[in-house]
Amino acid sequence: DMKGHFDPAKCRYALGMQDRTIPDSDISVSSSWSDSTAARHSRLESSDGDGAWCPAGPVFPKEEEYLQVDLRRLHLVALVGTQGRHAGGLGKEFSRSYRLRYSRDGRRWMDWKDRWGQEVISGNEDPGGVVLKDLGPPMVARLVRFYPRADRVMSVCLRVELYGCLWRDGLLSYTAPVGQTMQLSEMVYLNDSTYDGYTAGGLQYGGLGQLADGVVGLDDFRQSQELRVWPGYDYVGWSNHSFPSGYVEMEFEFDRLRSFQTMQVHCNNMHTLGARLPGGVECRFKRGPAMAWEGEPVHHALGGSLGDPRARAISVPLGGHVGRFLQCRFLFAGPWLLFSEISFISDVVNDSSDTFPPAPWWPPGPPPTNFSSLELEPRGQQPVAKAEGSPTA
């Protein structure tokens, strides 16, 4: 049980296009055909103006026109919905496919890709129907852009909704060595296949991926919760032979200064195939990127039960230490370390003595003092159900 960890199945609330909790000022576009098809008319099920956003320029062959939604805070976006321009039966424009780009800081934009690396999403078949798309993997974003596509010169129009929940962890990025391949009777690919940061010199940095997607792995790491994926998909893993130091080191960057209570790491322990819980964890903290790591590391020894091969979450007490960056070393206790999820229980700290500027991911205005006081879901809403075997899955 990943106590305190978000459940992606419950993170499917409408984020405010249709009900207008996202204000017009947070919707922008690359261009509009006219004022009656401007950004503010891009809300799902809205019939305002001429009934949708329609870009001024063609979307074929260049796919450069976009509709941007600013969620003002980091959210996990798990689902999107699209519609064309119905306009009481007068509109005939819709987008058969589209791409998504997203950003956590307004500077670096990432292309959303599915688990097989495909960027293009199937859209609408008619102007009025709503098509929901489950985003596997989900994206952690503040800003989301929809890029409508066409396979020929034609008019396209769009209305949208985003579904998800507030990203309460506050985790902006993690840095880790690239996950490795395990050679069994079949190859087991233990890479972080949805990581959205950079990769260089054996290191992934500046992004988030499978260790922060809410999906915990199964007891047998060769199996997966997902359909049609490769062996090892749910786990990121490292061989002790690659780390003569005896540990894998990871860094975590957060949105604000935080007081950390617990880190939870979901680990595999299929020791018959070489996977073992870590023998221990050491973490240290710092308040700003240019600052030194503070004090002595927090040590947590783990006397993991070798006999029980089940995967499990281990809780690492962090003692309320304050920082915006964590560096943790996970000690090998066997041939392989395999993690499927890492999450944190923490509280935002209001510290007027901060000598570094706050991270730019936060909206203008004061941040909340404690995430536990925030509403995770909009009031009175039900999450969108995930239909088994539906085209949205």
């Epitope: 391949t181 290191l203 032979h241």
Partner: antibody
Framework: QVQLVESGGRVVQPGRSLRLSCTAS????????MLWVRQAPGKGLEWIGT???????YYASWAKGRFTISRDNSKNTLYLQMNSLRAEDTAVYYC???????????????WGQGTLVTVSS | DIQMTQSPSSVSASVGDRVTITCQAS??????LAWYQQKPGKAPKLLIS???DLASGVPSRFSGSGSGTDFTLTISSLQPEDFATYYC?????????FGGGTKVEIK
């Protein structure tokens, strides 16, 4: 384009010191594991040492104490400081960049052209 | 420290021959092994990382196998441009020793 260029190799007397440089272009040195490797005339490749992206250094047992790897991120340059040089240190010295393949394991994908150090009286 | 031992130190072969080079580690290194090709006066070129994984642009006649302590580089059908010296390397995040090299010469 992406490349490594070594410099500083020359003839030097035994017992003296020498610093080699390796200047990177097209990428940031501090994001990579960087290695120094040497090759004596007619001999095989010999690993000298490694510096990690976190500035941890590793050395071959024979190089510890005499050789020091460092880098200057502002100049995007890697250095090899060699002290108390001996005739057997005569070699071509290469710097190289470690990258991961699709399977997550390291390999030296990018090499410099090498710089010759001759230790002779 | 881990030592890497290559054999043979040299091999004479003809174009079209199948050539096998072996590399032995003094203790288990899992799959943390790379192979390089070097031609006279040139810097080495990465062929394979992680025992099996061909580097970009390397022809499929090169292949690697093994795990633990014993590894093999195979050239299935030797081409004129393959006459060179080949090195194995244990390359973890740390100490990275090479094997002694195997020179593939024209018979």
């Amino acid at each position: 384009q992406v490349q490594l260029v070594e410099s500083g190799g020359r003839v030097v007397q035994p017992g003296r010191s020498l610093r080699l440089s390796c200047t990177a272009s097209g990428f940031s040195l501090n994001r990579y594991y960087m290695l120094w490797v040497r090759q004596a005339p007619g001999k095989g490749l010999e690993w000298i040492g490694t510096i990690s992206y976190g500035d941890t250094t590793y050395y071959a047992s024979w190089a510890k104490g005499r050789f020091t790897i460092s880098r200057d991120n502002s100049k995007n340059t890697l250095y090899l400081q060699m002290n108390s040089l001996r005739a057997e240190d005569t070699a071509v010295y290469y710097c190289a960049r470690a990258d991961t393949g699709d399977n997550g394991y390291l390999g030296l994908q990018l090499w410099g052209q090498g710089t010759l150090v001759t230790v002779s009286s | 420290d881990i030592q890497m031992t290559q054999s043979p130190s040299s091999v004479s072969a003809s174009v079209g021959d199948r050539v096998t080079i072996t590399c032995q580690a003094s203790q288990s290194i899992g799959s943390v092994l790379a192979w390089y090709q070097q031609k006279p006066g040139k810097a080495p070129k990465l062929l394979i990382s992680g025992v099996f994984d061909l580097a970009s642009g390397v022809p499929s006649r090169f292949s690697g196998s093994g795990s633990g302590t014993d590894f093999t580089l195979t050239i299935s059908s030797l081409q004129p441009e393959d006459f060179a010296t080949y090195y194995c390397q244990y390359i973890p995040y740390g100490s990275s020793p090479f094997g002694g090299g195997t020179k593939v010469e024209i018979k």
